[in-house]
Amino acid sequence: KFSKQSWGLENEALIVRCPRQGKPSYTVDWYYSQTNKSIPTQERNRVFASGQLLKFLPAAVADSGIYTCIVRSPTFNRTGYANVTIYKKQSDCNVPDYLMYSTVSGSEKNSKIYCPTIDLYNWTAPLEWFKNCQALQGSRYRAHKSFLVIDNVMTEDAGDYTCKFIHNENGANYSVTATRSFTVKDEQGFSLFPVIGAPAQNEIKEVEIGKNANLTCSACFGKGTQFLAAVLWQLNGTKITDFGEPRIQQEEGQNQSFSNGLACLDMVLRIADVKEEDLLLQYDCLALNLHGLRRHTVRLSRKNPIDHHS
């Protein structure tokens, strides 16, 4: 119950906090549990105690073990345990699970990645940040105080992020690295009454007789994944499949495109070998979702051959 895991890499600084809290004026004693040996408070030692903190400057694999802290208050002593593991540095780029701090999630609106445990150290900006061992560069990445901000977060930004900083103790510098996973979650979606982007209401589409023509019905329905959303074409108020003209078919275009984060759908109406009678039909682009239905009507007109030649 009063135990906390801490880990670090050899030759890096590691500072551990006693799991028991008290007043600043309380004395805190530290012991190496296996030997019950008191940890010195003199800063000249590589491992020393400083109140609530136990400092390894730098850490060695042999420092691994359980450390006991006793917070001495006027009425009783509070005992806590710090389970410390120091690992050898990895030669490859992979950060093993046992070195990872808690995963954080971000979204388009909130993309802060805090550098784990940094509040324990005496560090100065800037922090260095790496993703999968590559130094982060470019205007999308901003190291701010103890966290990294990523602008315009995308799903590809998910991955393992490592912060690197220098701890200063009495003029001596020690490196510290810490890694955590970052996942990208969709912003909370919402649904709107459909908005038809194309065609315009009562648009006149010029076509050439004998040639093929395409009409695109495009509508947006809100943000995020939509529970129910559809776009379709009707001919004279009849579904394409029921109209019975094999020359006129509809096919889905770009499905659920998230440009600007909006959930949009396209439906393309393909008319093969345009005929005179096609000019007499009413073409309706329909967009519908749980909020209702919106309709834009298009008519075809013969393209003027003179315009064509010019």
Epitope: K1, F2, K4, R17, P19, R20, Q21, G22, K23, P24, S25, Y26, T27, R72, S73, P74, T75, G80, D119
Partner: antibody
């Protein structure tokens, strides 16, 4: 600068529960415990309990044991105090106060009124 | 529980004069481990949370004017305002900061004579 910002006033019926939040900023939340103190109208200050914000271990005053629950959310740097089975004498201003040698930092207070 | 008894309940003092508030605890607040007396003093004005003035019986909190001073050890403690100012009108509380449950005195209201 250190700030403790508490949730707004509440009106509750006898027998109900109330949960008050205390959002900390300007310092590392898990470095200091958080106390809860209440003050009924015209009464002395009364300590309810505190929580070790690092490991989440609460300690309660005997007068409130069984009725009070103190929790914390480290990711939100927020401490919570929930008081159940409310009675009219629980009408008071409830404060959070950061642990230290004395309580140097207090929330602005949350007035909880218990009335039928 | 440690009982904190303050006296007087109220105190009327002329501006510029000395105000003295006493606090007695039912058990010693001295911790032999570090020789600290775990007693705090607070000032509270209407509609505001208490403000820490003194901790450790005699250590002034940063930003507190030096006209406020604390003294005492063990079970008997005193808060002194050496030269009362208009802004010092408030209720003053002592607090057992030694052991759970932390307990407060009943308060002393300081008024202008």
């Amino acid at each position: 600068q250190v700030q403790l910002v508490q949730s707004g006033a509440e009106v509750k019926k006898p027998g109900a529960s109330v949960k008050v939040s205390c959002k900390a900023s300007g310092y590392t939340f898990i470095n200091y415990g958080m106390n809860w103190v209440r003050q009924a109208p015209g009464q002395r200050l009364e300590w309810m309990g505190w929580i070790n914000t690092y490991i989440g271990e609460p300690t309660y005053g005997d007068n409130f044991k069984g009725r009070v629950t103190i929790t914390r959310d480290t990711s939100a740097s927020t401490a919570y105090m929930e008081l159940s089975s409310l009675r009219s004498e629980d009408t008071a201003v409830y404060y959070c106060a950061r642990e230290g040698d004395g309580f140097a930092y207090w929330g602005q207070g949350t007035l909880v009124t218990v009335s039928s | 529980d440690i009982v904190m008894t303050q006296s007087p309940d109220s105190l009327a003092v002329s501006l510029g004069e000395r105000a003295t508030i006493n606090c007695k605890s039912s058990q010693s607040l001295l911790y032999s481990g570090n020789q600290n007396n775990y007693l705090a003093w607070y000032q509270q004005k209407p509609g505001q949370p208490p403000k820490l003035l003194i901790y450790g019986a005699s250590t002034r909190e940063s930003g507190v004017p030096d006209r406020f001073s604390g003294s005492g050890s063990g079970t008997d403690f005193t808060l002194t305002i050496s030269s009362l100012q208009a802004e010092d009108l408030a209720v003053y509380y002592c607090q057992n900061d030694h052991s759970y449950p932390y307990t407060f005195g009943g308060g002393t209201k300081v008024e202008i004579k």
